[in-house]
C-alpha cells in the first residue's frame, strides 16, 4: 500500500549500554481513528468521537505493523521478520536495545473497510543511539522499584539529570494509557499500592532549527514489599508517671507501632518490676487496632482490679519487640492528691 499519505512522527531512543532496556512504539492513529482501534480507553465517555470511519471489529489488536527497509524493498511484516520485537495490542515492544532497531515503522488497521481507511496509517521514524559518556552519569534506571505503603517517585530516565525547573513538558503513559495530569519529569506517588506497577513511558519534544522529534524512554516499575529496618515504637503510654486512686480499678494501655515484616512476629507484653524482682504479667490478648500497608498498631492492656499501696512502689513496664529490636516504656503509679 502507498505510505506517502501516512502521518509521520520522529522518535529518538537513547539507550544505556550498561543496562537492559526496553522500548515501545504506540500506533498513534490520527483522531478519531485512534479511539476506535487502540486507545479507546484513553477517552472519557464524554469524549467519544461522533463518527468512527473504521467499521472493523473492536478487537484491540486490529492493527498491522511493518518495517520499511532502508534499501527500498517492500514493507516487511514485523511479526515474521523480527523475533526481538513483540506486538501487544497496538503497542510494539522492543525487547533489546541496539542501533539496528533504527528505521521506519508503519502501523495501520488490519481491516480496510472504506476508502478513508487507505490513508489511515502512521509512519514512525525511529532513531536509536547509545548514550554518550558525556551524558549524565546518574540517570534514573529503566527499572525502578516502589516500596509498598511508602511515598515514592518515578523518574523519566532521559530527563533525570535536569532540575524540575529546566525540564520540558513531559507526556507520561502507563500501560499504554495517557496519564493526562502528569507533566513533569517525575511522577510523585503519595502512597504506593500494587496497582502503581506497570510499564511507564515518558515523552518530551526536542527541536533544532530543522525539525522536532519525540525523545522517549520506557520505565518498568515494580512495587516491592520491604521489611522494616526499625524496631517498634511505643505510642502509648507517653508519660512515665500516672496519677491513680487507691482502691479503684485501673487499666493501662500499651500501644505500639510495628513496621511491615513479611514474617511478622510482634511481641507486646507487660511485666512488673518490684525492687530487684521482675515478672511477666498475664494480661488479655494483644489486638490489632490499626492496619495499613506500612504500619500495624497493636494494643495490649494491663488490668488491675484495685490499685494497692504496693502498686505505687512498682514499675509497670511495656515491652515490645520485632526482629530488629525491642523498646520499653515504664510507668510509675502516683497517688492522686485531693
Amino acid at each position: 500500500f502507498n505510505i506517502s499519505g501516512c502521518s509521520t512522527k520522529k522518535l529518538l531512543w537513547t539507550y544505556s549500554t550498561r543496562s537492559e532496556e526496553e522500548f515501545v512504539l504506540f500506533c498513534d492513529l490520527p483522531e478519531p481513528q485512534k479511539s476506535h482501534f487502540c486507545h479507546r480507553n484513553r477517552l472519557s465517555p464524554k469524549q467519544v468521537p461522533e463518527h468512527l470511519p473504521f467499521m472493523g471489529s473492536n478487537d484491540l489488536s486490529d492493527v498491522q505493523w511493518y518495517q520499511q527497509p532502508s534499501n527500498g524493498d517492500p514493507l516487511e511484516d514485523i511479526r515474521k521478520s523480527y523475533p526481538h520485537i513483540i506486538q501487544d495490542k497496538c503497542t510494539l515492544h522492543f525487547l533489546t536495545p541496539g542501533v539496528n532497531n533504527s528505521g521506519s515503522y508503519i502501523c495501520r488497521p488490519k481491516m480496510i473497510k472504506s476508502p478513508y481507511d487507505v490513508a489511515c496509517c502512521v509512519k514512525m521514524i525511529l532513531e536509536v543511539k547509545p548514550q554518550t559518556n558525556a551524558s549524565c552519569e546518574y540517570s534514573a534506571s529503566h527499572k525502578q522499584d516502589l516500596l509498598l505503603g511508602s511515598t515514592g517517585s518515578i523518574s523519566c530516565p532521559s530527563l533525570s539529570c535536569q532540575s524540575d525547573a529546566q525540564s520540558p513538558a513531559v507526556t507520561w503513559y502507563k500501560n499504554g494509557k495517557l496519564l493526562s495530569v502528569e507533566r513533569s519529569n517525575r511522577i510523585v506517588v503519595d502512597e504506593v499500592y500494587d496497582y502503581h506497577q506497570g510499564t511507564y513511558v515518558c515523552d518530551y519534544t526536542q527541536s533544532d532549527t530543522v525539525s522536532s522529534w519525540t525523545v522517549r524512554a520506557v520505565v518498568q516499575v515494580r512495587t516491592i514489599v520491604g521489611d522494616t529496618k526499625l524496631k517498634p515504637d511505643i505510642l502509648d503510654p507517653v508519660e512515665d508517671t500516672l496519677e491513680v486512686e487507691l482502691g479503684k480499678p485501673l487499666t493501662i494501655s500499651c500501644k505500639a507501632r510495628f513496621g511491615f515484616e513479611r514474617v511478622f512476629n510482634p511481641v507486646i507484653k507487660w511485666y512488673i518490676k518490684d525492687s530487684d524482682l521482675e515478672w511477666e504479667v498475664s494480661v488479655p490478648e494483644a489486638k490489632s487496632i490499626k492496619s495499613t500497608l506500612k504500619d500495624e498498631i497493636i494494643e495490649r492492656n494491663i488490668i488491675l482490679e484495685k490499685v494497692t499501696q504496693r502498686d505505687l512502689r512498682r514499675k509497670f513496664v511495656c515491652f515490645v519487640q520485632n526482629s530488629i529490636g525491642n523498646t520499653t516504656q515504664s510507668v510509675q503509679l502516683k497517688e492522686k492528691r485531693g
Epitope: V225, E261, R262
Partner: antibody, heavy 123, light 110 residues
Framework: EVQLVESGGGLVQPGGSLRLSCAAS????????IHWVRQAPGKGLEWVAS????????YYADSVKGRFTISADTSKNTAYLQMNSLRAEDTAVYYC????????????????WGQGTLVTVSS | DIQMTQSPSSLSASVGDRVTITCRAS??????VAWYQQKPGKAPKLLIY???SLYSGVPSRFSGSRSGTDFTLTISSLQPEDFATYYC????????????FGQGTKVEIK
C-alpha cells in the same frame, strides 16, 4: 526458621472423615493467612480453603463448601482442615501454605509451604 | 469466579532459551498475582508476587509482568535447574474464589 508440617493424611472410605493438621513454627500464625492447597495425582494445584485469624475470616472453594471446615488454634500454632463426606475426587496431596496477613493483609504470595500429606479416598 | 487460563500447557526448550508463560484472567483483577515453580514430588516454591516483584532468593533471570488481564512469567535464559512445572495464581481480595491457580505449564528439555 519458618516451617509448616502437615499431618493426619491417610486412607479413608468414601463418606468418611479426616482431620488434617498444619503445625507452624518460626512465625506467628495470628498475623498470617493459612491456606490449604491440594494436588490430585498427576494434576495441577487446587486451592481448598483459607483462614486469616487476625481477621476472623474463613474462605472455601465451591468444591468443598459445606463439607470441609478450616480452623486455627493460635495458642498451639496449628491450623486444621476437618474433612467430612469425603469423595473419591478429594484424593490428593494436601499442602498447607502461608501468606503474610498483617499490614492490611495485602497478598504477597504463598511464601512458605509444608511437604504435603496424602489423602486417599477409596473403598 | 475468576478463571486463570495458563498457556502453553507444556513447552520444550533448551538451556539458554528465553521462555515466556502467560496467564489470562477471565476478568479484571488486582495485581495480586503470584508465580510458583514445582518439581516432581516437591512443594511449590514462590518466584514472583504482586505480578512483577521477585521473591527474595529467586534468581534475576525470572521476571513477571502485567498487561491488562494478561500476566507473563519470563525466564530470560533457561538453566538446567529450571525444568519444572510453573503455576500462576491470583488472589481476589475478600471474594469467595479467594485463590485461583492456572492449569500449569510443564517446561521440558528439548
Amino acid at each position: 526458621e519458618v516451617q509448616l508440617v502437615e499431618s493426619g493424611g491417610g486412607l479413608v472410605q468414601p463418606g468418611g472423615s479426616l482431620r488434617l493438621s498444619c503445625a507452624a513454627s518460626g512465625f506467628n500464625p495470628y498475623y498470617s493467612s493459612i491456606h490449604w492447597v491440594r494436588q490430585a495425582p498427576g494434576k495441577g494445584l487446587e486451592w481448598v480453603a483459607s483462614i486469616s485469624p487476625s481477621y476472623s475470616s474463613t474462605y472455601y472453594a465451591d468444591s468443598v463448601k459445606g463439607r470441609f471446615t478450616i480452623s486455627a488454634d493460635t495458642s498451639k500454632n496449628t491450623a486444621y482442615l476437618q474433612m467430612n463426606s469425603l469423595r473419591a475426587e478429594d484424593t490428593a496431596v494436601y499442602y498447607c501454605a502461608r501468606s503474610s496477613c498483617s499490614h492490611s493483609c495485602r497478598f504477597y504470595g504463598l511464601d512458605y509451604w509444608g511437604q504435603g500429606t496424602l489423602v486417599t479416598v477409596s473403598s | 469466579d475468576i478463571q486463570m487460563t495458563q498457556s502453553p500447557s507444556s513447552l520444550s526448550a533448551s538451556v539458554g532459551d528465553r521462555v515466556t508463560i502467560t496467564c489470562r484472567a477471565s476478568q479484571s483483577v488486582s495485581s495480586a498475582v503470584a508465580w510458583y515453580q514445582q518439581k516432581p514430588g516437591k512443594a511449590p516454591k514462590l518466584l514472583i508476587y504482586s505480578a512483577s516483584s521477585l521473591y527474595s532468593g529467586v534468581p534475576s533471570r525470572f521476571s513477571g509482568s502485567r498487561s491488562g488481564t494478561d500476566f507473563t512469567l519470563t525466564i530470560s535464559s533457561l538453566q538446567p535447574e529450571d525444568f519444572a512445572t510453573y503455576y500462576c495464581q491470583q488472589y481476589a481480595y475478600h471474594e469467595p474464589g479467594l485463590l485461583t491457580f492456572g492449569q500449569g505449564t510443564k517446561v521440558e528439555i528439548k
